[in-house]
């Protein structure tokens, strides 16, 4: 099946201090390689989460990514702050013969708006 990375929501709004889920699904796990989430684009993009076993504070996977047929790579960001605002991209990589892996497809992006906490 042809690989497609889908981020269904173009944007989400969340109140500061709350949690939000950023959805991402794939149509294929091939070619093998990691899936990572970034905020921003280009050289200055920031790694938010990687499905390769490392620990990321405040960010967790929504589905059980250890399922061998898992296609859901959605993440939950907890205790959101204004600094978390921005556009988030779910990115599929193909393993490289040497570092780094090759980015092969990105979702369309989900913009996160952080609303002031109601007083």
């Amino acid at each position: 099946k042809e690989l497609k990375v889908t981020q269904p929501e173009k944007s989400v709004s969340v109140a500061a201090g709350d949690s939000t889920v950023l959805n991402c699904t794939l149509t294929s796990l091939l070619p093998v390689g990691p899936i990572k989430w970034y905020r921003g684009v280009g050289q200055s993009r920031l790694l938010i989460y990687s499905f390769t076993g490392e620990h990321f504070p405040r960010v967790t996977n929504v589905s059980d990514a250890t399922k061998r047929n898992n296609m859901d790579f959605s993440i939950r960001i907890s205790n959101v702050t204004p600094e978390d605002a921005g556009t988030y991209y779910c990115v599929k990589f193909q393993k490289g013969p040497s570092e780094p892996d090759t980015e092969i497809q990105s979702g369309g992006g989900t913009e996160v708006y952080v609303l002031a906490k109601p007083s």
Epitope: L29, L30, P31, V32, P34, F51, T52, G53, D64, A65, T66, K67, R68, N69, K95, S98, E99
Partner: antibody
Framework: DVQLVDSGGGVVRPGESLRLSCAAS????????MSWVRQAPGKGLEWLAG????????YYIDSVKGRFTISRDNSKNSLYLQMNSLTAEDTAVYYC???????????WGLGTLVTVSS | ALTQPASVSANPGETVKITCSGG??????YGWYQQKSPGSAPVTVI????KRPSDIPSRFSGSASGSAATLTITGVRVEDEAVYFC???????????FGAGTTLTVL
Amino acid sequence: DVQLVDSGGGVVRPGESLRLSCAASGFTFSSYAMSWVRQAPGKGLEWLAGISAGGSDTYYIDSVKGRFTISRDNSKNSLYLQMNSLTAEDTAVYYCARETWNHLFDYWGLGTLVTVSS
Amino acid sequence: ALTQPASVSANPGETVKITCSGGDYYSTYYGWYQQKSPGSAPVTVIHSDDKRPSDIPSRFSGSASGSAATLTITGVRVEDEAVYFCGAYDGRTYINTFGAGTTLTVL
């Protein structure tokens, strides 16, 4: 330190059953997929079965499908392998192994010996 | 099936390369497992083609390209004598396989 301790092996007769256990410590067990691998005397390694971190998904090699069942109890940090209808060909050292994110193995149990003999 | 040489030998200090072929690069990740005696617990020396666990000496390295993976031991030592199994995970079939093992003798 990650520790995996296999147990439950022993001598059984053909056709009998055995349940192997693997006690895990030193890591968040509920976050990792796990597998069972065996090694027959004088032979190489053979992967048998794997289970997702939550326990809902299981995977088997064809030769044990229907006879062996992999399961886990995350509240007890334990992995299990229920083996039914054992034959002499199942004689081996059985290892539990922790999976990496891409379903290879990073830590192994010490192994438990299963002997099927009449 | 994964294919690897039955045995290799080297003098201390030399560089040893063990190859493992049979996987599809598009769908396969490789690992390397050291077993010092039959029935003893394997030790992972490489996973994810080229990732070395933190407690494994830097003389062990791994690579993969095409349909093969290679384990390289640079400056081999007597204590590296063991059987080395290559292993693979195939993302197409969701199945793990192993090679038959390569016996490394350090002369």
